[in-house]
């Protein structure tokens, strides 16, 4: 595999079961969906829904399939050649700097800002300053900070959820 492998990625100990398909390696490597035998003579298929390999490899085992966490939806299941694809549920997003969990999207923008981008599974709502158009990357505003127009008028669009 081209990616760095950590021990958490690995499938539980397994020996080649009789039902696992075998083929011969090509130039010492096995195709995606397989791992190599100890003696390097056979390619052993990964187990569908349990483990996978995405690249030509000479690894002794396939990588363990990811299980989607609560708060995530499964976009596509794990196959022998591709890991599970999980996505944050609606109203939540996953940041690059904290990929281990889905965080709730903000429900509105801070005072003096307008919403220019909706909540998506991979990004929070995007707010910019009304005047300058500068992006805001601050923390979730306090409820009273959420932008509303002057008293008695309807809330501006940036106070609605995305």
């Amino acid at each position: 595999e081209s990616a760095l492998i950590t021990q958490q990625d690995l499938a539980p100990q397994q020996r080649a079961a009789p039902q696992q398909k075998r083929s011969s390696p090509s130039e010492g490597l096995c195709p995606p969906g397989h791992h190599i035998s100890e003696d390097g003579r056979d390619c052993i298929s990964c187990k569908y829904g349990q483990d996978y390999s995405t690249h030509w490899n000479d690894l002794l085992f396939c990588l363990r399939c990811t299980r989607c966490d609560s708060g995530e939806v499964e976009l596509s299941p794990c196959t022998t050649t591709r890991n599970t694809v999980c996505q944050c549920e609606e109203g939540t997003f996953r940041e690059e700097d904290s990929p281990e969990m889905c965080r709730k999207c903000r429900t509105g923008c801070p005072r003096g800002m307008v919403k220019v981008g909706d909540c998506t599974p991979w990004s929070d709502i995007e707010c910019v300053h009304k005047e300058s158009g500068t992006k805001h990357s601050g923390e979730v505003p306090a409820v009273e900070e959420t932008v509303t127009s002057s008293p008695g008028t309807p809330a501006s669009p940036c106070s609605l959820s995305g």
């Epitope: 100990q13 020996r15 100890e38 003696d39 003579r41 000479d58 690894l59 002794l60 085992f61």
Partner: nanobody, 123 residues
């Protein structure tokens, strides 16, 4: 974190025997190979022997076949190398290494290495 600690090296006369050990910790891979490599003074790393943890597949370099025996104790997570009929040319630092690749007799296939233990064969 994977750690490998070799022991058992020392000075021995030609024709004598030594048993090297390599205690491994932090290994939770479903299968892996453990090997002995050696480096003689002024020379490069040379593959000596390998054994796989799950199926027990074993490899030896031609230069040690019939004289050296590799074995493992799964319960202690320890690798051994029984060296008999030692010769002056067996003098080297012996390293224990771990791989997660099949048919691994090349150094580049090994991800984890011990610090080494010195074996000197001399009269």
């Amino acid at each position: 974190e994977v750690q490998l600690l070799e022991s058992g090296g020392g000075l021995v006369q030609p024709g004598g025997s030594l048993r090297l050990s390599c205690a491994a910790s932090g290994l939770t891979f479903p299968n892996y190979g453990m090997s002995w490599f050696r480096q003689a003074p002024g020379k490069g790393l040379e593959f000596v022997s390998a054994i796989y943890w799950s199926g027990g597949t074993v490899y030896y370099a031609d230069s040690v076949k019939g004289r050296f025996t590799i074995s493992r104790d799964n319960s202690k997570n320890t690798l051994y190398l029984q060296m008999n009929s030692l010769r002056a040319e067996d003098t080297a630092v012996y390293y224990c290494a771990v791989t997660i690749r099949g048919a691994a007799t090349q150094t580049w296939k090994y991800d984890y290495w011990g610090q080494g233990t010195l074996v000197t064969v001399s009269s």
